[in-house]
């Protein structure tokens, strides 16, 4: 929301998690055969076919680098629950190792469990809705958002105590992540710091900042699944 079209293939880690051939959520390639996304994304997937699109800029147009991968295994965080934003992480094992190249490349992720300094500008990208009418873009969008301190995010007018040490917030004043961006990356200084949570949330409202799962807080779990 309030972003702009991304430079084509400049974010080679970007993934589209798809259900029955349609974009469902964002994702981020963290290893040759693994994509990190949000657990809530697959809540209603039930019997549908889940696939991962890599190397894409346009969802609909043919591109040489685009490739759709089947999912061998979906591993939601064991503590994720439908009614909470906590532990909203999902690891998807691709049916085979991704073919790496200029448009497909894993992103280094933060392992040091320390908060990103408030005010730091971080990049969020995705194919989520771009206006309040719910328009879905065909090409990848991105926006730069300043990190918001947790105390402000926890105010009663904001997220009222819901932001644990394993979550972080970014400002949401007109520019924001939104529906369809869930599972996508929050990248600060070229490193994956957060994953867009997939709880339902009003977008673009200053008093309802974007909520992101801090990957550093889940380093042990990610490592154990990827091992």
């Amino acid at each position: 929301l309030g972003g702009r079209e991304a430079e084509a293939h400049a974010r080679p880690y970007m993934a589209s998690v798809q259900l029955n051939g349609a974009h469902l959520c964002g994702g981020v390639l963290v290893a040759e055969q693994w994509v990190l996304s949000a657990a809530h994304c697959l809540e209603d997937a039930a019997d549908g076919k889940v696939q991962v699109l890599l190397g894409a800029h346009s969802l609909s147009q043919p591109e040489p680098s685009k490739r759709l991968y089947d999912v061998l295994r979906a591993v939601p965080h064991p503590d994720s629950q439908p009614d909470t934003i906590d532990h909203d992480l999902l690891l998807l094992q691709l049916s085979e190792k991704a073919t790496l190249g200029p448009a497909v490349r894993p992103l280094p992720w933060q392992r040091v469990d320390r908060d990103v300094a408030p005010g730091t500008l971080c990049d969020v990208a995705g194919w989520g809705i771009v206006n309040h009418a719910g328009r879905r873009p065909d090409s990848l969008q991105h926006v730069l958002l300043p990190v918001l301190d947790r105390a402000t995010c926890n105010r009663r007018t904001h997220h009222d105590g819901a932001i644990t040490e394993r979550l972080m917030c970014a400002e949401s004043n007109r520019r924001d992540s939104c529906k369809g961006d869930s599972g996508g990356p929050l990248v600060c200084g070229g490193v994956l710091e957060g994953v867009v949570t997939s709880g339902s949330r009003v977008c673009g409202n200053r008093k309802k900042p974007g909520i992101y799962t801090r990957v550093a807080s889940y380093a042990a779990w990610i490592d154990s699944v990827l091992a």
């Epitope: 408030p118 301190d149 947790r150 105390a151 402000t152 926890n154 105010r155 009663r156 007018t157 904001h158 997220h159 009222d160 105590g161 819901a162 932001i163 040490e165």
Partner: antibody
Framework: EVQLVQSGAEVKKPGASVKVSCKAS????????MYWVRQAPGQGLEWIGE????????NFNEKFKSRATLTVDTSTSTAYLELSSLRSEDTAVYYC????????WGQGTLVTVSS | DIQMTQSPSSLSASVGDRVTITCKAS??????VAWFQQKPGKAPKGLIY???SRYSGVPSRFSGSGSGTDFTLTISSLQPEDFATYYC?????????FGQGTKVEIK
């Protein structure tokens, strides 16, 4: 278990200053604003101001802006309210309270201003 | 400053009665209103936040409603432990402000 434990009662002379402490435990101190409220004997509740323990940023009720100072010591998870140029009408119970999540309040500190 | 005008300032009621306390804001505060209960010599205790959400552990007989400028706290069936003073608070705008309180006494 979240607790906000305030310092003991104080008796001060008019014109003096008082510093009330509020020690937090059971949660990450820097993750929540702390606000201060006072209640004069037999009266209602009055908001003094608040502090962001992470940044040290403050917001005040204009009425107290020139006399109140809010600070924190993150190493001990303690918030402080200092009120200067005390007058008899500052006699009240002073409360700290956590802003956000469950409504946790300190037990209150009675400050009596009397000559 | 936003004024929070509470009414009545006091009321007498019996155990089992339905009690309603109202709070009127001098300007729109959306749903950024909380209700507190205070007993003599004790700190206020949170009952309701966001105008209508109950804090955990608060009995279901307490309910809140309203948005904009008009808010209500209802006790569906007054219990002996509910005799206290009740305050509304708006947290939409600085400075945060409280109503003047409603004392609920035994009839």
């Amino acid at each position: 278990e979240v607790q906000l434990v305030q310092s003991g009662a104080e008796v001060k002379k008019p014109g003096a200053s008082v510093k009330v402490s509020c020690k937090a435990s059971g949660y990450t101190f820097t993750s929540y604003y702390m606000y201060w409220v006072r209640q004069a004997p037999g009266q209602g509740l009055e908001w003094i101001g608040e502090i962001n323990p992470y940044s040290g940023g403050t917001n005040f009720n204009e009425k107290f802006k020139s006399r109140a100072t809010l600070t924190v010591d993150t190493s001990t998870s303690t918030a402080y309210l200092e009120l200067s140029s005390l007058r008899s009408e500052d006699t009240a119970v002073y409360y700290c309270a956590r802003e956000g999540g469950f409504a946790y309040w300190g037990q209150g500190t009675l400050v009596t201003v009397s000559s | 400053d936003i004024q929070m005008t509470q009414s009545p300032s006091s009321l007498s009621a019996s155990v089992g009665d339905r009690v309603t306390i109202t709070c009127k804001a001098s300007q729109n505060v959306d749903t950024d209103v909380a209700w507190f209960q205070q007993k003599p010599g004790k700190a206020p205790k949170g009952l309701i936040y966001s105008a209508s959400s109950r804090y955990s552990g608060v009995p279901s007989r307490f309910s809140g409603s309203g948005s904009g400028t008009d808010f209500t706290l209802t006790i569906s069936s007054l219990q002996p432990e509910d005799f206290a003073t009740y305050y509304c608070q708006q947290y939409n705008n600085y400075p945060l402000t409280f109503g003047q309180g409603t004392k609920v006494e035994i009839k």
